[in-house]
């Protein structure tokens, strides 16, 4: 941080290294929950129109993508992934790209990803091709 | 050298007005994704707006969005902030600062990323 710069104890909108050099804030979709038509697709476009400075600098950018018996939804947001969100660990939250894994909840769909670039929760990807977790 | 400089600041009243300035100099500024940042008293950075070098696409913080408008003039190595509908809230400090896109972190603190700052003061 320059020397001008206050820097504030026991905040966390600023994030700084040993050498005192400042992280940027992740740019993310931000679009809450919407109603989505994407299924039965290896990726699908958000189609979220917002894109928001991340208030955080630790902050990813996450979908969560649900189906169940009346509707398909696609929420965008940004977050801590030191927090668990909707009750997950973002365990791919250092991902370049939305990589889609199904999680276990009852009486749904449930898929859930993270990442760590620009925007990257503006494309979700389903296909397997992608994912990095398949003992094949 | 690198140069930062805002301009534009001062003591507003609630659902007032402001425009600030930041001039750059000494580096290439078409190449450098540009912020404003604002650090209220005793408080942590918040990072308000950016703007891409080429394009003009702009992002905002969930609390000025509609309210605050960035833009830049890359023949006058000029960024601007109009900052409408002003709250006590906003009151702060306001710096300009540079980013490569794509590159998460600043070199480091000693390194020419910062304007000096001007102080907005938003009360009746």
């Known amino acids: 941080i320059p020397p001008h710069v206050q820097k504030s104890v026991n905040n966390d909108m600023i994030v700084t290294d040993n050498n005192g050099a400042v992280k940027f804030p992740q740019l993310c979709k931000f679009c809450d929950v919407r109603f989505s038509t994407c299924d039965n697709q290896k990726s699908c476009m958000s189609n979220c129109s917002i894109t928001s400075i991340c208030e955080k600098p630790q902050e990813v950018c996450v979908a969560v993508w649900r189906k169940n018996d009346e509707n398909i939804t696609l929420e965008t947001v940004c977050h801590d992934p030191k927090l668990p969100y909707h009750d997950f660990i973002l365990e791919d939250a250092a991902s370049p790209k939305c990589i889609m894994k199904e999680k276990k909840k009852p009486g749904e769909t449930f898929f859930m990803c993270s990442c760590s670039s620009d925007e990257c929760n503006d494309n979700i990807i389903f296909s397997e091709e992608y994912n990095t977790s398949n003992p094949d | 050298e690198v140069q930062l400089l805002e301009s534009g600041g001062g003591l507003v009243q609630p659902g007032g007005s402001l425009r600030l300035s930041c001039a750059a100099s000494?580096?290439?500024?078409?190449?450098?994704r540009m912020w404003w940042v604002r650090q209220a008293p005793g408080k942590g950075l918040e990072w308000v707006s950016a703007i891409e070098p080429i394009g003009n696409r702009t992002y905002y913080a969930r609390s000025v969005v509609g309210r605050f408008t960035i833009s830049r003039d890359n023949s006058k190595n000029t960024l601007y902030l109009q900052m409408n509908s002003l709250r006590a809230e906003d009151t702060a400090v306001y710096y300009c600062?540079?980013?490569?896109?794509?590159?998460?972190?600043?070199?480091?603190?000693?390194?020419?990323?910062w304007g000096q700052g001007t102080l907005v003061t938003v009360s009746s």
């Open positions: 000494g580096f290439t500024f078409t190449e450098y």
């Open positions: 600062a540079k980013q490569i896109p794509g590159r998460k972190w600043t070199a480091n603190s000693r390194f020419d990323y």
